[in-house]
């Protein structure tokens, strides 16, 4: 039960995280015009990974796409790449994890296969989350660098006679969405990996140990032996932990094949 819950929760958290990564990637507000200690302009500028927008005081908004590939900063291209890789890995991870879910039966899929798929999706979610966090962090670092550069020469002009308003940009909403989403995907991935450990079938070694007593030959086969670690050589298809306190008799009992839906 606990394994199913962990796996299910990991899937849901990852799903929310990947939806957030997609949303952040598509959002226009990666960087927004800094309004603090600046002349109050009648226009508000903000930029995304794919286009920049200007909102006038009247509400009129105009967005222009970056219709060049080579003319864009390498850092922006890197951020785009990281976010896209994160989305692709996350999407594949979601696809894999759907089939790996313990609550879904697909033919006669072995638990070992489900465990492997859960681990694979978990790793994909972790990498996806890391890609998103890295992408957002690279962009944030770029913003901070540019912010202080533009602060240094807030007003540039010809002998101080004509002043140019330097538009400074600060963190936009997409950065926070990206960080949170990346974190959720990462957490979801970790949960999937944890669930995988619980799904992994235990291999039982039936090694007979013979004790030769005087006049008798008795072979003791430790069929009901349980490994103290919880991950040792248990009986086939045995669930390690179900999250609830149970009697020793319950622990000893074997699950039927119908316990796995």
């Amino acid at each position: 039960m606990a394994v199913t819950a962990c796996q299910g929760l990991g899937f849901v958290v990852s799903l929310i995280g990947i939806a957030g990564i997609i949303a952040a990637t598509c959002m226009d507000q990666w960087s927004t015009q800094d309004l603090y200690n600046n002349p109050v302009t009648a226009v508000f500028n903000y930029q995304g990974l794919w286009r920049s927008c200007v909102r006038e005081s009247s509400g009129f908004t105009e967005c222009r796409g970056y219709f060049t590939l080579l003319g864009l900063p390498a850092m922006l291209q890197a951020v785009r790449a990281l976010m896209i890789v994160g989305i692709v890995l996350g999407a594949i991870g979601l696809l894999v994890s759907i089939f790996a879910l313990k609550c879904i039966r697909i033919g006669s899929m072995e638990d070992s296969a489900k465990a492997n798929m859960t681990l694979t999706s978990g790793i994909m979610f972790i990498v996806s989350g890391l890609c998103a966090i890295a992408g957002v962090s690279v962009f944030a670092n770029m913003l901070v660098t540019n912010f202080w550069m533009s602060t240094a020469n807030m007003y540039t002009g010809m002998g101080g006679m004509v002043q140019t308003v330097q538009t400074r940009y600060t963190f936009g909403a997409a950065l926070f969405v990206g960080w949170v989403a990346g974190g959720l995907t990462l957490i979801g991935g970790v949960m999937m990996c944890i669930a995988c450990r619980g799904l992994a079938p235990e291999e039982t070694n039936y090694k007979a140990v013979s004790y030769h007593a005087s006049g008798h030959s008795v072979a003791y086969k430790p069929g009901g032996f349980k490994a103290s670690t919880g991950f040792g050589s248990n009986t086939k298809n045995k669930k390690i932990y179900d999250g609830g306190a149970r009697t020793e008799d319950e622990v000893q009992s074997y699950p039927s094949k119908h316990d796995y839906v």
Epitope: Q33, P39, V40, T41, A42, V43, N45, Y46, Q47, S52, C53, V54, E56, S57, S58, G59, F60, E62, R64, V162, Q163, T164, V165, T167
Partner: antibody, heavy 118, light 113 residues
């Protein structure tokens, strides 16, 4: 067609307040902002403030302490009030519609001529 | 506040003549986000409120004759009337629409010779 009609007093005594109502037709105040501008022989055209479609306002810092702009969308009316008037506030006061783009004023009221005198 | 300086203060012209008037701002009116200049030109005839002619420094308002042309960028702007007509006699104002408070120039008065 778009129209802005102003109503207000022509003569106000010093230290009194000025109230002008700008009644609009041909458009809705829920979609457009309304600016207020005055024109005096000494200072030319001066922007005073604006009330945006959402009800938020921006004022000229020089008038912020004695100026208030409000509106009633249902009545299509914008209310302008300026306190503590002095003779140098004598001017023609205009309301003007904020154009949807360009941050400019595309339609103007006929103007309210104000004289501040005792 | 941004200071808008218009020159000349008055122009005496003959009908059919080409006219140019200048407007300079103390700060750049160019917005880097959309590469648009937030400068507007108005025409005001005696006893009337100002009328919008040109916004974004060079975009003509609908219904404005194409003899009116706005140009310039940053801090220097020009309004050109390719062939002055009698009905063009008025005062022309430029306005900063970029930084609050929005400010106007003192105007250029166009008079007939």
């Amino acid at each position: 067609q778009v129209q802005l009609k102003q109503s207000g007093p022509g003569l106000v005594q010093p230290s009194q307040s000025l109230s002008i109502t700008c009644t609009v037709s041909g458009f809705s105040l829920t979609y457009y902002g309304v600016h207020w501008v005055r024109q005096s022989p000494g200072k030319g055209l001066e922007w005073l403030g604006v009330i945006w479609r959402g009800g938020n306002t921006d004022y000229n810092a020089a008038f912020i302490s004695r100026l208030s702009i409000n509106k009633d969308n249902s009545k299509s009316q914008v209310f302008f009030k300026m306190n503590s008037l002095q003779p140098n506030d004598t001017a023609i006061y205009y309301c003007a519609r904020a154009a949807y783009y360009g941050n400019c004023f595309d339609y103007w009221g006929q103007g309210t001529t104000l004289t501040v005198s005792s | 506040d941004i200071v808008m300086t218009q020159s000349p203060s008055s122009l005496t012209v003959t009908a059919g003549e080409k006219v140019t008037m200048s407007c300079k701002s103390s700060q750049s009116l160019l917005n880097s986000g959309n590469q648009k200049n937030y400068l507007t030109w108005y025409q005001q005839k005696p006893g009337q409120p100002p009328k919008l002619l040109i916004y974004w420094a060079s975009t003509r308002e609908s219904g404005v004759p194409d003899r009116f042309t706005g140009s310039g960028s940053g801090t220097d702007f020009t309004l050109t009337i390719s062939s002055v007509q009698a009905e063009d006699l008025a005062v022309y104002y430029c306005q900063n629409n970029y930084i609050y408070p929005l400010t106007f120039g003192a105007g250029t008065k166009l008079e007939l010779k």
